[in-house]
Interface confidence: low
């Protein structure tokens, strides 16, 4: 999967979309999840709703929102005031059973609220140390990592 | 109407490879799981693996993780399953089956099997 | 994976006669989504297998009414209300809400 990129500002709203197949998914639940590490586990931050006919509700975990538009095939991940915390890989996954497709990786940067007295070109990226080769940062909502980009440093 | 054809019996020689075809028609074949399962002689079902046509997604069961590859054609409506390094225990009848959709949510019932195609690995 | 065990393994019956057929699962089949993916399907001597019921009371099409389907969680049952020569066999449960899908032993049904 190649990861998609989602900037925000810090203390706004950040909507994620994770576009899927409706046939190939459907009957299923969704989640999103924050990857600890590169290869650590996916640590599931809030799912849809419990009966799969009432995904189209929102559910939230603290200021995280999904919902699932099962006929159109969309999950919409919503981070409300958004934090430099927030920056880092996520997923969406669709759950089948004990097992977990991966629908999109997710790049989640914060970028500084210019109106903010800090640094205005400030980033922040997942982990006070790491840091990302190659960043090529661009003024948009969403991207996809580019060739030879990594969504986390390597590990010597 | 649904119909799924497999390709003629095949003799293989230990340590070699078959490739067994399905071709399907009378359904959108892109959007529909279709799954292989054997049946060696006088024995049950066995679930080998899976393919969705439209992304070519797989899953396979461990037991053939590394010795299977399911593939599918979207051009001609065929999903493959090749089965590499035989032994006499691969003799079996193969099957290509598709999942059958029921909505609201999938029934991932196989609703409808090809004639099953017979393996037969020998010395 | 998940075991599925099917009892008895044959069974001889009198035409027009019912007939019972067990299947337990080793966890729970309850899918994510509430569904319940246990199905059963009949393999004629000689033939393809085929589907009978899917998510365990759901009759496929062309599927007489005889068949029934029941059970939950991890205990589930096909009945045959009154058996026909037609429907020798094996009969086969299986799951399919957790990959990798498997199959039960297989019931042998006879015609006394």
């Known amino acids: 999967h190649n990861t998609t990129v989602f900037q925000g500002v810090a203390g706004q709203s950040l909507q994620v979309s994770c576009p899927y197949d409706s046939m190939k998914h459907w009957g299923r639940r969704k989640a999103w999840c924050r990857q600890l590490g590169e290869k650590g586990p996916c640590q599931r931050v809030v799912s849809t709703h419990n009966l799969w006919l009432l995904s189209f509700l929102r559910r939230w975990n603290g200021s995280t929102a999904i919902t699932d538009d099962t006929l159109g095939g969309t999950l919409t991940i919503t981070l409300r005031n958004l934090q430099p915390h927030d920056a880092g890989l996520y997923q969406c996954q669709s759950l089948h059973g004990s097992e977990a497709d991966t629908l999109r990786k997710v790049l989640v940067e914060v970028l500084a609220d210019p109106l903010d007295h800090r640094d205005a070109g400030d980033l922040w990226f997942p982990g006070e140390s790491e840091s990302f080769e190659d960043a090529h940062v661009e003024h948009s909502i969403s991207r996809s990592l580019l060739e030879g980009e990594i969504p986390f440093p390597p590990t010597s | 109407q649904v119909q799924l054809v497999q390709s003629g019996a095949e003799v293989k020689k230990p340590g070699s490879s078959v490739k067994v075809s399905c071709k399907a028609s009378?359904?959108?074949?892109?959007?529909?799981?279709m799954n292989w399962v054997r049946q060696a002689p006088g024995q049950g079902l066995e679930w080998m693996g899976r393919?969705?046509?439209?992304?070519?997604?797989?899953n396979y069961a461990q037991k053939f993780q590394g010795r299977v590859t399911i593939t599918a054609d979207e051009s001609t409506s065929t999903a493959y399953m090749e089965l590499s390094s035989l032994r006499s225990e691969d003799t079996a009848v193969y099957y290509c089956?598709?999942?059958?959709?029921?909505?609201?949510?999938?029934?991932?019932?196989?609703?409808?099997w090809g004639q099953g195609t017979l393996v037969t690995v020998s010395s | 994976d998940v075991v599925m065990t099917q009892t008895p393994l044959s069974l001889s019956v009198t035409p027009g006669q019912p007939a019972s057929i067990s299947c337990r699962s080793s966890?729970?089949?309850?899918?994510?989504?509430?569904?319940?993916?246990l199905h059963w399907y009949l393999q004629k001597p000689g033939q393809s297998p085929q589907l009978l019921i899917y998510?365990?009371?759901n009759r496929f099409s062309g599927v007489p009414d005889r068949f029934s389907g029941s059970g939950s969680g991890t205990d589930f049952t096909l009945k045959i209300s009154r058996v026909e020569a037609e429907d020798v066999g094996v009969y086969y449960c299986?799951?399919?809400?957790?990959?990798?899908?498997?199959f039960g032993q297989g019931t042998k049904l006879e015609i006394k």
């Open positions: 089956a598709r999942l059958l959709r029921n909505q609201p949510g999938e029934s991932y019932a196989m609703d409808y």
């Open positions: 299986s799951q399919s809400t957790r990959v990798p899908y498997t």
């Open positions: 998510k365990v009371s």
């Open positions: 009378g359904y959108a074949f892109s959007s529909s799981w």
């Open positions: 966890q729970s089949l309850v899918h994510s989504n509430r569904y319940t993916y």
């Open positions: 393919i969705y046509p439209g992304d070519g997604d797989t």
